[in-house]
Amino acid sequence: ATKLTEEKYELKEGQTLDVKCDYTLEKFASSQKAWQIIRDGEMPKTLACTERPSKNSHPVQVGRIILEDYHDHGLLRVRMVNLQVEDSGLYQCVIYQPPKEPHMLFDRIRLVVTKGFSGTPGSNENSTQNVYKIPPTTTKALCPLYTSPRTVTQAPPKSTADVSTPDSEINLTNVTDIIRVPVFN
């Protein structure tokens, strides 16, 4: 049986979560992919998604979230920058495959963000809005809205996460345009 597993990351405010979700190259390279949060007692919410079809190595930015899909490697890279305490929660990657239901990858990420000096360049105890570097050409994608009432019971995402500081400069604001998306079994 598939075990629902989680991997925990304990970070401080201002740091960056960097997750690489591993998918089957041949099946899903150009499929639209999404990053979701699962809050207790709620359906998963889609925070950001790639374009449709997903473009190779093309950054998509939604607020403080940056997605990059590396088709040649079968990896979706998800970065959440300038983390805030309220970002703490359970996250997962999914692949949209209409008309079929979304395909969930493996290993959810349990993010725990605490207050305190992170010791990371670009963040300090007094800053409320940091400047982070991301690739200059970013796009915001619209995510599909699914309406099936069924709840999540299938395997969580396989991902491959680390903590990092991104690479080229832009001001990032809070996450916007969060779309409520049920995920199905």
């Epitope: 970070l11 960097d18 089957t24 491959t160 680390d162």
Partner: antibody, heavy 119, light 108 residues
Framework: EVQLLESGGGLVQPGGSLRLSCAAS????????MSWVRQAPGKGLEWVST????????YYADSVKGRFTISRDNSKNTLDLQMNSLRAEDTAVYYC????????????WGQGTLVTVSS | EIVMTQSPATLSVSPGERATLSCRAS??????LAWYQQKPGQAPRLLIY???TRATGIPDRFSGSGSGTEFTLTISSLQSEDFAVYYC??????????FGQGTKVEIK
């Protein structure tokens, strides 16, 4: 409990071939990338090769590219490393390692199998 | 290829004392760093990942810090079972993923 058990090591002559296997249990094998990491006698760790959970993506260190082939059988929960054109410098303990669910580090290791390349 | 350099090569410490191990990357790896412990005749064991987060079952006397090119593994109060070789490893986006040459922590 995650368990990784390597086999197939032994003594082989330079230019020869050997096939290492790793039997995995205690986790959803097809959901995780797997790797081989080696350690020459008295030396440090060296990453050798990695294969994605589905087997669709493979990576190799330059030192083994074109000579070693990593593969997996998800129906049997096994990982293999086919080693051809072996050289003296390939002598090492070879570890099978599970790649973490969150990045390319290694959260579980087998006990290793010794490969000795010598005439 | 990113080169990982650990220092010192050998660290002599008395039980109960603090040990500080360093790892330096040849270019920025942000916090894409793991630490492993290896005892003689045994496989390595994951201690820290993402530069800061302790792996499951690792006691809190082990802590990781650093970002960019400079990283530290601290063992706050060395126990007899902590005398071993410690390796750092970078895991920036794509391979090769490289290890440091190791730091041996021995009894003083």
């Amino acid at each position: 409990e995650v368990q990784l058990l390597e086999s197939g090591g032994g003594l082989v002559q330079p230019g020869g071939s050997l096939r290492l296997s790793c039997a995995a249990s205690g986790f959803t094998f097809n959901a995780y990338a797997m790797s081989w990491v080696r350690q020459a006698p008295g030396k440090g760790l060296e990453w050798v090769s990695t294969i994605s959970g589905s087997g669709s993506t493979t990576y190799y260190a330059d030192s083994v590219k074109g000579r070693f082939t990593i593969s997996r059988d998800n129906s049997k929960n096994t990982l293999d490393l086919q080693m051809n054109s072996l050289r003296a410098e390939d002598t090492a303990v070879y570890y099978c390692a599970k790649v973490a669910g969150s990045n390319f580090f290694f959260d579980h290791w087998g006990q290793g199998t010794l490969v000795t390349v010598s005439s | 290829e990113i080169v990982m350099t650990q220092s010192p090569a050998t660290l002599s410490v008395s039980p109960g004392e603090r040990a500080t191990l360093s790892c330096r990357a040849s270019q920025s790896i942000n916090a894409n760093l793991a630490w492993y412990q290896q005892k003689p005749g045994q496989a390595p064991r994951l201690l820290i990942y993402g530069a800061y987060t302790r792996a499951t079952g690792i006691p809190d006397r082990f802590s990781g810090s650093g970002s960019g090119t400079e990283f530290t593994l601290t063992i706050s109060s060395l126990q007899s079972e902590d005398f071993a070789v410690y390796y750092c490893q970078e895991f920036i986006l794509f391979p090769p993923w490289t290890f440091g040459q190791g730091t041996k922590v021995e009894i003083k």
